[in-house]
Interface confidence: low
């Protein structure tokens, strides 16, 4: 039994971490930085979308490499419950707190914080220099996807590196999931292609929620047919001329559901790997 | 002066790193497995493309994941003078051998045989699982490609890592390399939209040369939309019904020129990076 | 041949409603967004509603907001104008549109029109 | 919304005369014009759209042109057919069409 309640020691924590943070703000400013130029590079690349066949290619293009670069900038994460393992040992053992307050005030202070950052910088530098869907929910929903994406990354980190006292190895089999993970995300092979017996593991990748959550966000009720009209090429049939049409090919779900599900599934997905995360660390206690 | 000459150097020196790669075939053999393994799910993730416009898709997705799978994979190469750099300086100093001795020795018996492994067992694998092109010269053309990608990767590596003590910062640099050169590729982003005052930037890029080639030799002379008589349908502009359409799109040049001039690009680049490598060994000695 | 034929017109009183149907055959009718055009006898054209492709995104003129709805069903081929509690300047001939291209809102295609008259 | 005006109301012509239509908006509209034509009875027809683009199986005769807030529809050389009311609409700003040109024989 504790002296101290749990809310205390999860302020005590949050507190630490967070002075921490502030005492080192290298690492901070440096990432917000290269966030920063990041997002005006591609924000340059990529400036103000067209609307036609380059348009659905450009879009995609964009969406996936902001999924992808949420995901793999997320493996820092590994580093959360890695480096401070010996002294969370030694703490724990002296009764300094319960593992749920370290746990919770880890996630608080430094993941929360440092995760929504780029995900905020991205989409309010992207945005507008691409000419994305003009259109207040869309915006929002673009940069709630994108923060969904850094959560649910991070918190697969902190499954896979939890208890772990090298950075290394777990860092090498994120870049490795998230590799396969990249592949189902569903702009390097289109879905609805992929044989039975392996189109499963889309279900398992978590760029693959995240893109087609920012896709259905961006292409429902697009037009990337220049000039077409009914009166002249209606017999156009092989032609993606609507972000409808274009959803459709890749097997997305048009209705409301077929966006939010993607949201339920990385929520969940974040739910088990912070589980997963925090069992390790119970565990950890146990033989140390 | 040396007592003897530049070919029994050459001579020694590949021996002597042949025997050590034979001598220590675990790193070989790992790599020729996980290149054999990711080549087989490749093949089963895109088997048998379809002719329409999910083939489009599925064709630049394989490609353009095998294109930056070589880069990405080259930056191992980083290590070939670092991991030896003191008994480079010491047996260059105690007059064993020339620095282009050791230098083409190095290439000949390391570089040039663990980076056209990959490229060949990906060719052979793939592009029957794939179901790509079903002509000889096609299939070699790939094959070529693939390991000019590698040698350019590999050497573009060589250039930022001789004459260093350590590999992590060149790893870093490298991949940070790659990741822009990726986005220039052609893929994430239509070549032909990006600004002038921008776009510039593709040339450097060495996936954006190996990839262009890839569909190229693939593409022309293909069609994508089933049952789609020639005399019909001509009015549609907006559908990508052809290779040729596809390519036009991407800003490919259709002309023979423009398959080649991409591997010139690359020859150019192995012999700039390669010359540079080799001058950082040259005055790597000078300060030693 | 694109065809476009409105049905559903005709005469009501003040505050009744009334439902426009437009069948669209000659061209891929879910490419297209759609809209309501009007024109009320001696008076010049009026843009009434619009639809996207999908039918999740709808606009509307002020004067008809919050009375008309317009929907479309793309299995049907059908666009649709639901017109509630209508009043006498409601009286006009509503065409049935097709928009060339968002974002350039040109009608393109017309239908031959159907008579609505609100009237005591 | 931006209130667009067509001059004259009227106007009498001659098969074969050169005929000039003008459309001016109470503000800048990008070129985003387009110009219908009714004849009496029947559906309104697209004869340009983006102020100078001919759209398909309209006569080459048929012009437009103009920028800011002024914009014209020329007919080079009026042939009977031609005799109908033609209307402007804006589509930058809201969606308006002005008050219509009849245009008559004389």
């Known amino acids: 039994s504790y002296t101290t309640s749990f809310c205390h020691q999860l302020r005590w924590v949050s507190k630490r971490s967070f002075k921490n943070l502030l005492g080192n703000p290298q690492a901070s400013i440096a990432q917000i930085i290269v966030t920063v130029i990041l997002g005006l590079v591609i924000g340059a690349i990529y400036f103000g979308l067209n609307n036609d066949s380059t348009g659905i290619q450009n879009r995609a293009g964009v969406l996936f490499f902001l999924t992808t670069n949420q995901c793999f900038s997320s493996v820092s994460a590994v580093e959360l419950f890695v480096v401070e393992k010996k002294l969370f040992i030694h703490e724990y053992i002296s009764g300094y707190y319960r593992v749920s307050s370290y746990f919770f005030g880890k996630l608080l202070s430094d993941l929360l914080p440092m995760r929504m950052l780029p995900s905020i910088i991205f989409t309010c530098i992207v945005y507008f220099m691409l000419g994305l869907k003009p259109t207040a929910d869309a915006f929002f929903i673009m940069m709630f996807t994108l923060m969904m994406v850094a959560y649910s990354a991070s918190s697969m980190a902190l499954a896979i590196a939890a208890g772990q006292s090298v950075v290394s190895v777990a860092t090498l089999l994120m870049t490795i999931c998230f590799v396969f993970m990249m592949i189902f995300s569903g702009l390097l092979v289109n879905l609805t292609t992929i044989a039975s017996w392996l189109s499963w593991l889309q279900y398992f990748s978590i760029p693959r929620y995240g893109f087609t959550a920012l896709q259905h966000n961006e292409f429902l009720g697009q037009n990337f047919c220049p000039g077409l009209n009914a009166t002249v090429n209606n017999t156009c049939n092989y032609a993606t001329c609507t972000g409808e049409e274009y959803l459709t090919k890749q097997g997305i779900d048009l209705s409301p559901w077929g966006l939010w599900k993607n949201h339920v599934a990385l929520a969940c997905m974040i739910v088990i790997f912070l589980t997963i995360a925090y069992l390790k660390l119970l565990f950890l206690k146990k033989y140390s | 002066s040396y007592t003897t000459s530049f070919c029994h150097q050459l001579r020694w020196v590949s021996k002597r790193s042949f025997k050590n790669l034979l001598g220590n075939p675990q790193a070989s053999i790992a790599q020729i497995i996980v290149t054999v393994i990711l080549g087989l799910v490749i093949g089963a993730i895109y088997f048998g493309l379809n002719n329409d416009s999910t083939g489009i898709q599925n064709r630049a997705g394989v490609l353009f994941f095998l294109t930056t799978n070589q880069c990405f994979s080259s930056v191992s190469a980083v290590e070939l003078f670092v991991v030896e750099k003191k008994l480079f300086i010491h047996e260059y100093i105690s007059g064993y051998y020339r620095v282009s001795s050791y230098f083409f020795g190095k290439l000949l018996s390391d570089l040039l045989p663990m980076r056209m492994l990959p490229s060949i067992i990906f060719t052979c694998i793939v592009y029957f699982m794939l179901g790509l092109k079903p002509t000889a010269d096609a299939f070699f053309i790939m094959m070529f490609t693939l390991m000019m990608v590698a040698y350019s990767a590999s050497s573009m590596a060589l250039a930022i890592a001789a004459g260093q003590s350590v590999v992590s910062v060149a790893t870093l640099l490298m991949t940070i390399c790659f990741v822009f050169m990726m986005i220039f590729s052609g893929l994430l982003v239509n070549l032909t939209t990006i600004a002038s005052w921008l776009s510039w930037l593709q040339y450097f890029s060495i996936p954006r040369y190996g990839f262009t080639a890839l569909q190229h030799n693939e593409f022309l002379g293909q069609n994508f939309c089933p049952g789609l008589n020639a005399t019909v349908n001509n009015t549609c502009n907006y559908a990508t019904c052809t290779g040729e359409e596809y390519l036009t799109k991407q800003g490919i040049d259709l002309s023979p020129w423009g398959l080649w001039k991409n591997h010139v690009a690359l020859a150019c680049m192995i012999v700039i990076f390669l010359t540079i490598a080799y001058l950082k060994l040259l005055f790597l000695k000078k300060y030693s | 041949e694109v065809q476009l034929v409105e049905s559903g017109g005709g005469l009501v009183q003040p505050g009744r409603s009334l439902k426009l149907s437009c069948a669209a055959s000659?061209?891929?009718?879910?490419?297209?967004?759609m809209a309501w055009v009007r024109q009320a006898p001696t008076k010049g054209l009026e843009w009434v509603a619009y639809i996207n492709t999908g039918g999740g995104t709808t606009y509307y003129r002020d004067s008809v907001k919050g009375r008309f709805t317009i929907s479309r069903d793309n299995a049907k081929t059908t666009l649709y104008l639901q017109m509630d509690s209508l009043r006498s300047e409601d009286t006009a001939t509503y065409y049935c549109?097709?928009?060339?291209?968002?974002?350039?809102?040109?009608?393109?295609?017309w239908g031959q029109g159907a008579s609505v008259t609100v009237s005591s | 919304d931006v209130v667009m005006t067509q001059s004259p109301s009227l106007l009498s012509a001659s098969v074969g005369d050169r005929v000039t239509l003008t459309c001016k908006g109470s503000q800048n509209i990008n070129n985003f014009l387009a110009w219908y034509q009714q004849k009496l009875g029947e559906a309104p027809k697209l004869l340009t759209y983006k102020t100078n683009s001919l759209h398909t199986g309209i006569p080459s005769r048929f012009s437009g042109s103009g920028s800011g807030t002024d914009y014209t529809l020329t007919i080079s050389s009026l042939h009977s057919e031609d005799l109908a009311t033609y209307y402007c609409y804006q589509y930058n700003n809201g969606y308006t069409f002005g008050p219509g040109t009849k245009l008559e024989l004389k």
């Open positions: 549109t097709t928009l060339a291209a968002p974002w350039n809102y040109v009608m393109d295609a």
């Open positions: 000659g061209f891929i009718f879910s490419r297209f967004y």
